[in-house]
C-alpha cells in the first residue's frame, strides 16, 4: 500500500534504509538478493510480502521496532545467508512458539544483538540453523547459558555475547558447538572461570567482567588452541595459571588488581604453590604438555593498570617471542633486563606512569627494542649508557622524569647524566619536563633524530652547538615553555625541519630565513615578538602553511609581511580570534584592519 517506495536499487541490491517504512514493501523486484530495511519502523515481519523475495541472500532488518515474527516468516527464503534483526524489540515477542525464527537452513550469520532478550525467550527464538557460522547475541539481557541455549548449531564458529548480564554458564553450555573458535563474553557479570575446557577455542574475550580467578580444566582431553585471551578490566589478584595454553599469542590483563610475587617459589613446578602469587606464574608447563614452555609463543602482553611492584627475572625468561609488553600504570620502582638474550624479540616496552627510579638494561638485552616509553616516572642518575646500549631503539619518551643529558663524546657531563649521542637508530626523543638546566654542546651528535621535544624545561639554557649534528635529520623540534629569551640555534641550517614549536617563551627575534627551507608549521604563541619582518621570513613563504602568533605584542606598523599573509598570502595565520596589534599610542586594533595610511600618520612609514 506504498506502491512506490523510494528505495535505491542497484543490480540485485535494494536499500530502503531510514525511509519511515512501517512494513516490508511488496513492490520490489522479485529477484532481489540483498535487501536493507534498517532504520525504519517495522513492527512485524510477515511471511507475506517477505516470502515474495525468494532469491534473498542478505536481509538487514536492524534498528526497527520489530516485536512480532510470524511463524514461518523466513521459510520461503531458502537462499538466505545473512540475517540481521539487531536493535529491535524481540523481547516483546511473547507469542513466540519454539524455534520462533523457524529453520534457517542456509543462514551463515545471524545478528540478534540489542533486543533485550532474556534466557528463556532466547531458547524459544533460536531454531535449527545447521549452516550458522556467526551468531551475535550482544547487548541483550541474558543472565545464564544452559545446555539447551545453543542447540542445532553444529557449524557455529563465532559467538558474540558481549554486554549481557551473564552470571552463570552451565557446564556443557558450549558442548553442542564443536567448531566454536571465537567467543566474546566481554561486559557481563562473570566472577570466576574455574574450569575452562574449550580446547578448540582460539579467541576468548572475557574483558569487563568481575573475574577473580581464571583456571583451565585440570585434565583437558586435547591441547588447547587458544591464541587470544582478553581479561582486561576484571578483578584478578594474581597472574593466571596459563601453563596449559601454550599457543597464546595475545594476552591482555590490564586493569586488574594483579601483583607479582616477590619471594622465591615454594614449589619447584610453580603451579600449585602457596598463595603469594607464585601459583599464578606460568613458570613451567604441566606434565604431558609437549611445548614445555608456557607463554613461549606470546607476542603481546598487556599488564597495564595493575598493582605490580616488581618483575621477577624468572617471569621474563619465558617470554622469548614477546614483541609488545605494556607495564604502564603500575607501581614499579625498578625494572631490570640485564641478562644476555632477555626479551630478544621485544619491540615495544611501555613502562610509563610507574614509580621507576632505576632502570638497568644489560648491554645485549632487548636487542630488538624499537620503542621505549618511560614518561611519568622518577628516573634520575641513570647509568650513562642506559639507552646507548639499545641497538634498535627508534623512539624514546622520557617526559616527566629527571634525566640530565650528557654533552657530546668529547664533552663528558656531570655524574648521573645520560648519553644521547651515538645512538644511531634513535629517531624520536621526548625530554619534556625533566628540569633540564643546560643542554650541552653535542648532546645528540651521531644520533639522527627526526623528532625532538625539549618543552617544559623552564630556565633551560641551550648551549651553542647543543643541536649540532641534527641539521640534516631533524623534522620536528619543540622548545615550548622554556622561558627562552634568545635561541642559540641556527634554525635556517635545519634543512628538513617541518614543524617548529617555540610557544610560551620570551623570544623577540628569529634568525633570518633567506633561503627556501622545509618549515610548514611555526608556533610562536605567547612570546615577545613585535615584528616579523619580511627580510627574515621571506625564505619561509614557499613552505610555511601555518603560523601561530596569538599572545604576542605585535606592532601594527612594520608588519607588512604579516599583514600580507593575513590578506592574501599562502600562509594560514591561525587566528581563532583576530590578531591584535598595537600602535605606538598603545591603541589596540585588529591587524587585519590596519591600512597603510594608518602607519603614515605622524611620520610612521611602513618599512616593509
Amino acid at each position: 500500500h506504498q506502491d512506490k517506495v523510494p528505495c535505491k536499487m542497484v543490480d540485485k541490491k535494494v536499500s530502503c534504509q531510514v525511509l519511515g517504512l512501517l512494513q516490508v514493501p511488496s513492490v520490489l523486484p522479485p529477484d532481489t538478493e540483498t535487501l536493507d530495511l534498517s532504520g525504519n519502523q517495522l513492527r512485524s515481519i510477515l511471511a507475506s510480502p517477505l516470502g515474495f523475495y525468494t532469491a534473498l541472500r542478505h536481509l538487514d532488518l536492524s534498528t526497527n521496532e520489530i516485536s512480532f515474527l510470524q511463524p514461518g516468516a523466513f521459510q520461503a527464503l531458502t537462499h538466505l545467508e545473512h540475517l540481521s534483526l539487531a536493535h529491535n524489540r524481540l523481547a516483546m515477542a511473547t507469542a513466540l512458539s519454539a524455534g520462533g525464527l523457524g529453520p534457517l537452513p542456509r543462514v551463515t550469520s545471524l545478528d540478534l544483538s540489542g533486543n533485550s532478550l532474556y534466557s528463556g525467550l532466547l531458547e524459544r527464538l533460536l531454531g535449527e540453523a545447521p549452516s550458522l557460522h556467526t551468531l551475535s547475541l550482544a547487548e541483550n539481557s541474558l543472565t545464564r547459558l544452559t545446555r539447551h541455549t545453543f542447540r542445532d548449531m553444529p557449524a557455529l564458529e563465532q559467538l558474540d555475547l558481549h554486554s549481557n548480564v551473564l552470571m552463570d554458564i552451565e557446564d556443557g553450555a558450549f558442548e553442542g558447538l564443536p567448531r566454536l573458535t571465537h567467543l566474546n563474553l566481554s561486559r557481563n557479570s562473570l566472577t570466576c572461570i574455574s574450569d575452562f575446557s574449550l580446547q578448540q577455542l582460539r579467541v576468548l574475550d572475557l574483558s569487563c567482567n568481575s573475574i577473580e580467578a581464571f583456571q583451565t580444566a585440570s585434565q583437558p582431553q586435547a591441547e588447547f588452541q587458544l591464541t587470544w585471551l582478553d581479561l582486561r578490566e576484571n578483578k584478578l589478584l594474581h597472574f593466571p595459571d596459563l601453563a596449559a595454553l601454550p599457543r597464546l599469542i595475545y594476552l591482555n590483563l590490564s586493569n586488574n588488581l594483579i601483583r607479582l610475587p616477590t619471594g622465591p617459589p615454594q614449589d619447584s613446578k610453580g603451579i600449585h604453590a602457596p598463595s603469594e602469587g607464585w601459583s599464578a606464574l606460568p613458570l613451567s608447563a604441566p606434565s604431558g604438555n609437549a611445548s614445555g614452555r608456557p607463554l613461549s609463543q606470546l607476542l603481546n602482553l598487556d599488564l597495564s593498570y595493575n598493582e605490580i611492584e616488581l618483575i621477577p627475572d624468572s617471569f621474563l625468561e619465558h617470554l622469548t617471542s614477546l614483541c609488545f609488553l605494556n607495564l604502564s600504570r603500575n607501581c614499579l620502582r625498578t625494572f631490570e633486563a640485564r641478562r644476555l638474550g632477555s626479551l630478544p624479540c621485544l619491540m615495544l616496552l611501555d613502562l610509563s606512569h610507574n614509580a621507576l627510579e632505576t632502570l638497568e638494561l644489560g648491554a645485549r638485552a632487548l636487542g630488538s627494542l624499537r620503542t621505549l616509553l618511560l614518561q611519568g616516572n622518577a628516573l634520575r642518575d641513570l647509568p650513562p649508557y642506559t639507552f646507548a646500549n639499545l641497538a634498535s631503539l627508534q623512539r624514546l619518551n622520557l617526559q616527566g622524569n629527571r634525566v640530565s643529558p650528557c654533552g657530546g663524546p668529547d664533552e663528558p657531563g656531570p655524574s648521573g647524566c645520560v648519553a644521547f649521542s651515538g645512538i644511531t637508530s634513535l629517531r624520536s626523543l621526548s625530554l619534556v619536563d625533566n628540569e633540564i638546566e643546560l643542554l650541552r654542546a653535542g648532546a645528540f651528535l651521531h644520533t639522527p633524530l627526526t623528532e625532538l621535544d625539549l618543552s617544559s624545561n623552564p630556565g633551560l639554557e641551550v648551549a651553542t652547538g647543543a643541536l649540532g649534528g641534527l641539521e640534516a635529520s631533524l623534522e620536528v623540534l619543540a622548545l615550548q615553555g622554556n622561558g627562552l629569551m634568545v635561541l642559540q640555534v641556527d634554525l635556517p641550517c635545519f634543512i628538513c625541519l617541518k614543524r617548529l614549536n617555540l610557544a610560551e617563551n620570551r623570544l623577540s627575534h628569529l634568525p633570518a630565513w633567506t633561503q627556501a627551507v622545509s618549515l610548514e608549521v611555526l608556533d610562536l604563541r605567547n612570546n615577545s615578538f613585535s615584528l616579523l619582518p619580511g627580510s627574515a621570513m621571506g625564505g619561509l613563504e614557499t613552505s610555511l602553511r601555518r603560523l601561530y602568533l596569538q599572545g604576542n605584542p605585535l606592532s601594527c606598523c612594520g608588519n607588512g609581511w604579516l599583514a600580507a599573509q593575513l590578506h592574501q598570502g599562502r600562509v594560514d595565520v591561525d587566528a581563532t580570534q583576530d590578531l591584535i596589534c598595537r600602535f605606538s599610542s598603545q591603541e589596540e586594533v585588529s591587524l587585519s584592519h590596519v591600512r597603510p595610511e594608518d602607519c603614515e600618520k605622524g611620520g610612521l612609514k611602513n618599512i616593509n
Epitope: V18, L22, Q23, G39, R43, S44, L46, M92, A93
Partner: antibody, heavy 119, light 107 residues
Framework: VQLVESGGGLVKPSQTLSLTCTVS????????VSWVRQPPGKGLEWIAT???????YYNPSLKSRVTISRDTSKNQVSLKLSSVTAADTAVYYC??????????????WGQGTLVTVSS | DIQMTQSPSSLSASVGDRVTITCQAS??????LAWYQQKPGKSPKLLIY???SLQDGVPSRFSGSGSGTHYTLTISSLQPEDFATYFC?????????FGQGTKVEIK
C-alpha cells in the same frame, strides 16, 4: 495529547478537499498519524497513515486521489483528496497510532471535522 | 486486504447484562486487534488493544480475548454509559481495516 482537525465544510464535486491536523503533546517524529473517515450513519474507513519517519501509506481504494504529508515544524499533518464526489461526504478524523506492540492501533483521536460534498 | 466481519450488527440489552460482540478476520492477525467505542456525535475511543490489553482509564468490565482469526469483546455488566457503537480493527498490516460496527441499544 491532542489532535485538532480543521478545513472541513462544503466542497464542490470534482474539487480537492484539504484538511489539516494540528497536534500537541507529542512529536510527529515519534508517533505515526492516520486519517480515518466516517460517512453519516456508517462505519469507519482508514484513509492514510504517515509514519514518524515520513513513510506514507494509503488505502488502495483511495490511493489515486489521496496525499498525506506533514510539517514537523508546525506540528501539522495534512490530507488532500482530489476529484471529490458526494460519496466522500463524511466526518474526517485524524488519530495518533500508539507507540507499542506489533500492531497499529489508534489511541488518541481528534474531534473530527465534517466535509460535505455538494454543488 | 484483511476483511473484518463483526457480529451482531446490533443488539438490545439491559443494564447489568453480560454482552459479547465478536469479530472475525479473514486471516490470522496474531492478536493485532483493537476495539473502539463510539457514542453519537463523538470520536471513537480506544478500549482494547493487542486483543486483550485494557487501555488506561477504561473500566475493568470491558475485556477482550481471542487469537488467530476469532476475537471477542465482553462487557461483563452493562452500564448506562456503555450504550454505543463498537468497532473492531485489525492493526497487523496495511491497509488497516475496521469491522462494520455493533450498535448496543437499550432493551
Amino acid at each position: 495529547v491532542q489532535l485538532v482537525e480543521s478545513g472541513g465544510g462544503l466542497v464542490k464535486p470534482s474539487q480537492t478537499l484539504s484538511l489539516t491536523c494540528t497536534v500537541s503533546g507529542f512529536s510527529l517524529t515519534s508517533f505515526h498519524v492516520s486519517w480515518v473517515r466516517q460517512p453519516p450513519g456508517k462505519g469507519l474507513e482508514w484513509i492514510a497513515t504517515i509514519s514518524s519517519g515520513g513513510g506514507t501509506y494509503y488505502n488502495p481504494s483511495l490511493k489515486s486521489r489521496v496525499t498525506i504529508s506533514r510539517d514537523t515544524s508546525k506540528n501539522q499533518v495534512s490530507l488532500k483528496l482530489s476529484s471529490v464526489t458526494a460519496a466522500d461526504t463524511a466526518v474526517y478524523y485524524c488519530a495518533r497510532i500508539s507507540g507499542w506492540g506489533h500492531y497499529y492501533v489508534m489511541d488518541v483521536w481528534g474531534q473530527g471535522t465534517l466535509v460535505t460534498v455538494s454543488s | 486486504d484483511i476483511q473484518m466481519t463483526q457480529s451482531p450488527s446490533s443488539l438490545s440489552a439491559s443494564v447489568g447484562d453480560r454482552v459479547t460482540i465478536t469479530c472475525q478476520a479473514s486471516e490470522d492477525i496474531y492478536s493485532g486487534l483493537a476495539w473502539y467505542q463510539q457514542k453519537p456525535g463523538k470520536s471513537p475511543k480506544l478500549l482494547i488493544y493487542g486483543a486483550g490489553s485494557l487501555q488506561d482509564g477504561v473500566p475493568s468490565r470491558f475485556s477482550g480475548s481471542g487469537s488467530g482469526t476469532h476475537y471477542t469483546l465482553t462487557i461483563s455488566s452493562l452500564q448506562p454509559e456503555d450504550f454505543a457503537t463498537y468497532f473492531c480493527q485489525q492493526g497487523l498490516k496495511f491497509p488497516l481495516t475496521f469491522g462494520q460496527g455493533t450498535k448496543v441499544e437499550i432493551k
